[in-house]
Interface confidence: low
């Protein structure tokens, strides 16, 4: 039962994270939460950084600055892959949740 519950939580978290990405960066509250998660957990996007390509308000070769290894204003614009966290946040935060919750 624990595994089923954990899978359900992960699925919900994945859906919610992607939903929040859709509102980035127009909803300031959402943006700050996602930025905090990405910066704190050193991750980018839901599955990986390429998820940001699919977000209407984000353009080609752009990720939020919070995806950068060294966060500076504008670092996510025309980013270099070596300079950003490529791992997805759902898996990374999910792993942390599994260990700590």
């Amino acid at each position: 039962a624990g595994y089923v519950f954990r899978d359900k939580v992960m699925s919900e978290f994945n859906n919610n994270f992607r939903q929040q990405m859709e509102n980035y960066p127009k909803n300031n509250h959402t943006a700050s939460i996602l930025d905090r998660m990405q910066a704190d957990f050193k991750c980018c996007g839901a599955a990986n950084y390429t998820d940001w390509e699919k977000i209407p308000s984000m353009s080609k070769n752009r990720v939020p600055d919070s995806c950068c290894i060294n966060v500076t204003v504008g670092c996510g614009i025309n980013f270099n892959e070596k300079a950003i966290h490529k791992e997805g946040c759902v898996e990374k935060i999910g792993g942390w949740l599994r260990k700590n919750v």
């Epitope: 127009k26 300031n28 390509e53 699919k54 209407p56 308000s57 353009s59 080609k60 070769n61 752009r62």
Partner: antibody, heavy 120, light 108 residues
Framework: EVQLVESGGALVQPGRSLRLSCAAS????????MHWVRQAPGKGLEWVSG????????GYADSVKGRFTISRDNAKKSLYLQMNSLRAEDTALYYC?????????????WGQGTLVTVSS | DIQMTQSPSSLSASVGDRVTITCRAS??????LNWYQQKPGKAPKLLIY???SLQSGVPSRFSGSGSGTDFTLTISSLQPEDFATYYC??????????FGQGTRLEIK
Amino acid sequence: EVQLVESGGALVQPGRSLRLSCAASGFTFDDYAMHWVRQAPGKGLEWVSGISWNSGTMGYADSVKGRFTISRDNAKKSLYLQMNSLRAEDTALYYCGKGLLHQWEVLDYWGQGTLVTVSS
Amino acid sequence: DIQMTQSPSSLSASVGDRVTITCRASQSISSYLNWYQQKPGKAPKLLIYAASSLQSGVPSRFSGSGSGTDFTLTISSLQPEDFATYYCQQSYSTPPITFGQGTRLEIK
């Protein structure tokens, strides 16, 4: 210099189809979102449709949803608007517009337009 | 959909005048508001984006302000080439992108 040149406008009967094209030059076409905006004679601007740089996101005005299809060919630096089941109220000058790099819904360059007249 | 309402619909002014056009959104759009100028027989031209950012090449007599639901476009000293129709546009909740109905600026 950025240039957008629309073509394909014509006089067509209601119910018929038409395909508009927009040839782009002077910028890296596949970095930018593109749009179609129309203006009926003597009226204001009405956004018709938009498409993201990689065709991953497309949007339509309710008035054309299900009848018009936007597409792009990045290799040919061209934007298209397939217009089916045309109505009299689709009569307008159709502009092709380029989105800003980091705010794709802001149109920083426009073509001169191509005229579509729907009449029997 | 978000409705954009401009006022006035038309106004007459003289060269050298300070002119203000307002745009109101039916709900908060943060600073996602853009202004365009259109002269008769010509394509629209972007003047201001993100409420107050002046587009490259646009004279500094044009300025924009506001956030939330109320926005203004100001021309500090009207020049002969400024007589045109001005449109506001929201880019907050899209699709659809929506424009105001336009404000026609005429010579007094």
